[in-house]
């Protein structure tokens, strides 16, 4: 009872191979690394087949296919490129991923490259089957800034350079502050933005009080305060957290974080900017921008910035001690002594940031909180020092550099 | 870094009572820092917290029966006028952005007459 | 103010088991949520801060989760050194300046 010699199938093999088989005599077929074996369309990784009485083989022999990783997942914000021709995904096919430049850059400046596994999965040297990250480029708008001149009381801001401004407002349109764009998904704006005005007299803060999520819009991309242009993008709010030592009376971590309902499109317009490194040294250049009243008491019609010195602690701690106000370690002061160029009403939130030269990126020093009047001599204006609590907004935002 | 809190102790109801807490290893000037309290065999009760700038803010059912204040070295609770019910084990906790990340060992206060 | 209600106590479940206590917040406090350990004549340890982040040098058996107001705490491989009263904490910043952090009522854990 002689069964019929048998053939290996194409990229695969037979044990034991013998000259001969026999009645009970069993093979098993299998495939070379990166085949899988194919039975009546089902695949798996060894087949046994076994001689019969009547000198047949219990099945024919199956095939060997090549292990196929199937279309690889698709990379938020990012796009993928086949480096095998016909856009293969086959066992040693290459694929590999990049982010969507200039906007995302991937994480840990990983290569990108996968390839198709035996086991019919693509893998990375580094991240195994998991796939990079692409995060948001911060800090590098594209329109740069031309110098600034010392000018007194602000100056409109050029179109793009400010792109990781954003404008809170009223579901009507009516703005009412300022913020600044986190990674893909957050507002930084000032806590005291989120509330009414409280009741001097009786300083709570109540339920009643606060914004919710649902009475206001975050609105990127934007440079005229009223009237609409085609880079604007309107985005609604999910959450807010105001911080958790946030002290309505005395502005004391004046800080607050929007989770937007979906993540905006960066482009030139609209991209995030840099949390802090470091602290702040006094005398640097920062740049406020915002939308709020000018000189004479008037709301300009674009964005507006000014270019001020960060003031020493100690000397604003001494500018506002005769108005019983403290300026805490939580708080950064800027400006002029002779006045003239400071935020004002409905800058609040917004975004006090300064340049890295070795860089060329921004980074957020602080956010428009208080003072005293606008603009008055001796009277510096007071921001939410990001750094002081820059470990919060990573806590609650995941947001790194 | 270590907290510690001292003045508790047997007190009639109505007698004023301060408890004191000390820090080594950071600075109390610009801690934030809690009073939470527990009643024998009863669950943690936040009591109020007072700022780096001094200011204070307390648990509803807390207003006017307690006061916090600091020094340049301590944070200090005063249980204005004890009842009864105020008989628990006093701890202070610094506040890392709203969590208390580090406790003292407490101190009991028992109010009796 | 915010209310937190924990599950209630005791839980038990043997040693190299799994044990979930939960604890609802009577209002949205996105992941403003801390796990605390007590065991008996200690203070409290902080286990977990924003719903779902271990604090340093706490054994990875521990983990915390949000689904919308509820979240969650979980103890997997259970030790007998785990045998404590476990208390949630809410610090969102919302209704009135008064509670600006609120406990739970404490879930305490025995182990078989």
């Known amino acids: 009872n002689e069964c019929p010699e048998l053939q290996p199938p194409v990229h695969g093999k037979i044990e034991p191979s013998q000259a001969k088989y026999f009645f009970k005599d069993q093979v098993l077929v299998s495939c070379d690394t990166g085949y899988k074996v194919l039975k009546d369309n089902v695949e798996m990784d060894t087949f046994q087949i076994e001689c019969l009485k009547d000198g047949t083989w219990s099945n024919k022999i199956p095939t060997c296919k090549i292990v196929d990783c199937r279309a690889p997942g698709e990379l938020e914000h990012g796009l993928i490129t086949f480096s095998t021709r016909n856009n293969l995904t086959t066992y040693k096919s290459e694929i590999k991923y990049s982010c969507q430049e200039p906007y995302y850059k991937m994480l840990n400046n990983n290569t990108g490259i996968y390839t198709c596994s035996a086991q019919g999965v693509w893998m990375n040297k580094v991240l195994g089957r998991s796939l990079p990250t692409c995060l948001p480029v911060c800090g590098l708008p594209k329109f740069s800034r031309k110098l600034m001149a010392r000018i007194f009381n602000g100056r409109p801001a050029q179109k793009g350079t400010t792109p990781w401004i954003a404008m809170l407002s009223h579901l009507n349109g009516q703005p009412f502050c300022g913020g600044s764009l986190l990674g893909s998904s957050w507002i930084v704006t000032a806590a005291h933005c989120l509330h009414q005005s409280l009741d001097p007299e009786d300083p709570t803060l109540r339920d009643s009080d606060l914004l919710s999520p649902s009475d206001f819009k975050i609105i990127l991309g934007k440079h005229w305060r009223l009237r609409s242009d085609e880079n604007e993008q309107h985005l609604g709010v999910k959450h807010t957290t105001l911080h958790p030592q946030y002290d309505p009376n005395t502005f004391e971590n004046d800080v607050a974080l929007v989770e937007l309902l979906e993540s905006p499109v960066l482009n030139a317009f609209v991209m995030p900017i840099c949390l802090p490194e470091g602290p702040q040294q006094e005398g640097a250049m920062v740049i406020v921008s915002g939308w709020g009243k000018q000189f004479l008491q008037r709301f300009p019609e674009t964005l507006m910035e000014i270019e001020i010195p960060i003031v020493d602690h100690s000397t604003c701690q001494k500018a506002y001690a005769p108005l019983k106000k403290k300026v805490t370690r939580d708080m950064i002061c800027a400006g002029e002594k002779e006045g003239g160029k400071d935020a004002c009403a409905g800058d609040a939130g917004g975004p006090m940031v300064t340049l890295n030269r070795e860089r060329g990126q921004w980074y957020l020093v602080g956010t428009v909180s208080w003072g005293d009047d606008c603009g008055k001599k001796d009277r510096y204006g007071v921001y939410s020092y990001i750094h002081h609590n820059k470990d919060w907004i990573q806590r609650v935002t995941g947001v790194r550099n | 870094q270590s907290v510690e809190e001292s003045g508790g102790r047997l007190v009639t109801p109505g007698t004023p009572l301060t408890l004191t807490c000390t820090a080594s290893?950071?600075?109390?000037?610009?801690?934030?820092m809690n009073w939470v309290r527990q009643a024998p065999g009863k669950g943690l009760e936040w009591i109020g917290i007072?700022?780096?700038?001094?200011s204070t803010w307390y648990a509803s059912w807390a207003k006017g029966r307690f006061t916090i204040s600091k020094t340049s070295t301590t944070v200090d609770l005063k249980i204005t006028s004890p009842t009864t019910e105020d008989t628990a084990t006093y701890f202070c906790?610094?506040?890392?952005?709203?969590?208390?990340?580090?406790w003292g060992p407490g101190t009991l206060v028992t109010v009796s007459s | 103010a915010v209310v937190l209600t924990q599950t209630a106590s005791p839980v038990s479940a043997p040693v190299g088991g799994t044990v979930t206590i939960k604890c609802q917040a009577s209002?949205?406090?996105?992941?403003?949520l801390a796990w605390y350990q007590q065991k008996p004549g200690q203070s409290p340890k902080l286990l977990i801060y924003?719903?779902?982040t271990l604090v340093s040098g706490v054994s990875s058996r521990f983990s915390g989760s949000r689904s919308g107001t509820e979240f969650s705490l979980t103890i997997s491989d259970l030790e007998c050194a785990d045998a404590a009263t476990y208390y949630c904490?809410?610090?969102?910043?919302?209704?009135?300046?008064?509670?600006?952090?609120?406990f739970g009522g404490g879930t305490k854990v025995e182990i078989k």
């Open positions: 290893g950071f600075s109390l000037s610009s801690a934030y």
């Open positions: 209002q949205s406090i996105g992941s403003s």
């Open positions: 007072i700022y780096a700038s001094g």
């Open positions: 906790a610094r506040d890392d952005y709203g969590t208390a990340d580090l």
């Open positions: 904490q809410n610090y969102y910043l919302s209704s009135s300046s008064a509670d600006r952090r609120t």
């Open positions: 924003g719903a779902s």
